[in-house]
């Protein structure tokens, strides 16, 4: 069974998948469609790296540009380094500028909805 066939079988169970499962799935060559990706739990999507999302979505990663204003895509973009976003070839903007440190302060993030940044 190839990755795409496997994805079709598990698609209906993915809604509540934790980050760890999504990371594992990204190694399976599944080419998740964007509609399914956007139904995933936001808290499960946010920790994924650009490389992991690229592997998870495969060719459908191109659709992030079309859906950049919608959650969880918008929130995920804000968490990524701009350098990493640039590798997607989509002209996505809003990532963390080069040279900034991301502090994972859970309380700060819970209050503001965005990560805390320290300038260079």
């Amino acid at each position: 069974m190839n990755g795409s066939e496997y994805f079709v079988k598990i698609q209906s169970f993915l809604g509540g998948a934790p980050t760890e499962d999504l990371k594992a799935l990204s190694q399976q060559n599944v080419s998740m469609d964007l509609a399914t990706f956007m139904k995933l739990r936001t808290d499960a999507v946010l920790p994924l790296t650009v490389a992991e999302v690229q592997k998870l979505l495969g060719p459908h990663v191109e659709g992030l540009k079309a859906e950049e204003r919608h959650r969880p895509v918008r929130d995920w973009i804000l968490r990524q380094r701009q350098d990493d976003l640039d590798t997607l070839g989509l002209g996505l903007q809003g990532g963390i500028p080069n040279g900034y440190l991301v502090l994972d302060l859970s309380m700060q993030e819970a209050l503001s909805g965005t990560p805390c940044l320290l300038g260079p």
Epitope: M38, A66, L88
Partner: antibody
């Protein structure tokens, strides 16, 4: 103004390979994916695959998986599509098309590839 | 693969009259989160490359005359030309970009009576 200028018509023998080029101008080449679509004479459109011009990652329609290679040259803002083991059914006009998000917003003028012995 | 079925195959229209083209997909093209339908319409005039008319099922591409309109959701979509003009002659294609391989309808040829 966005422009996609493709290479000229080609005549190839069965079993040979063809490489079609698509030179882009009028926009930032690495910010938009490039797709390739073909159209056999008098027929409809068939999506062949797409490529991320920033990383060079490409994705192909399984129908062409073993025969197609898509590449880019960022220094010249040019995309390439190579199709090998040509057969008569590959006679078609091959188009490059720049993505607008997912949809195909700009198309090249097309390159006619004729496969004939 | 998602199958796209277009009807009619061809259409002969009197100038100034409306025209309607149907496109049905074998599975939903709706993103239920964003409410976007992943469907585009293209026009291909004789001897030319295709051009984009509509994306997200109903968003008209800039520069496209407002006599063209797209509608529909899920699996059933329609392209309407409110008043056909001589320059509208050509073949019209729908395309899904929900899941690869992205597939096109078979095309609808529009002719002038």
């Amino acid at each position: 103004e966005v422009q996609l200028v493709q290479s000229g018509a080609e005549v190839k023998k069965p079993g040979a390979s063809v490489k079609v080029s698509c030179k882009a101008s009028g926009y930032t080449f690495t910010n938009y994916w490039m797709h390739w679509v073909r159209q056999a004479p008098g027929q409809g459109l068939e999506w062949m695959g797409n490529i991320n011009p920033s990383s060079g990652d490409s994705y192909y329609n399984e129908r062409f998986m073993s025969r197609v290679t898509m590449t880019v040259d960022k220094s010249t803002s040019t995309a390439y599509m190579e199709l090998s083991s040509l057969r008569s059914e590959d006679t078609a006009v091959y188009y490059c098309a720049r993505s607008g998000g997912l949809w195909l917003a700009f198309w090249g003028q097309g390159t006619l590839v004729t496969v004939s012995s | 693969d998602i199958v796209m079925t277009q009807t009619p195959l061809s259409l002969s229209v009197t100038p100034g009259q409306p025209a309607s083209i149907s496109c049905k997909s074998s599975q939903t093209l709706l993103n239920s989160v964003s409410q976007n339908n992943y469907l585009a319409w293209y026009q291909q005039k004789p001897g030319q490359s295709p051009t984009l008319l509509v994306y997200f099922a109903s968003t008209r591409e800039s520069g496209v005359p407002d006599r063209f309109s797209g509608s529909g959701s899920g699996t059933d979509f329609t392209l309407k030309i409110s008043r056909v003009e001589a320059e509208d002659v050509g073949v019209y294609y729908c395309q899904q970009h929900y899941r690869t391989p992205y597939t096109f309808g078979g095309g609808t040829k529009v002719e002038i009576k």
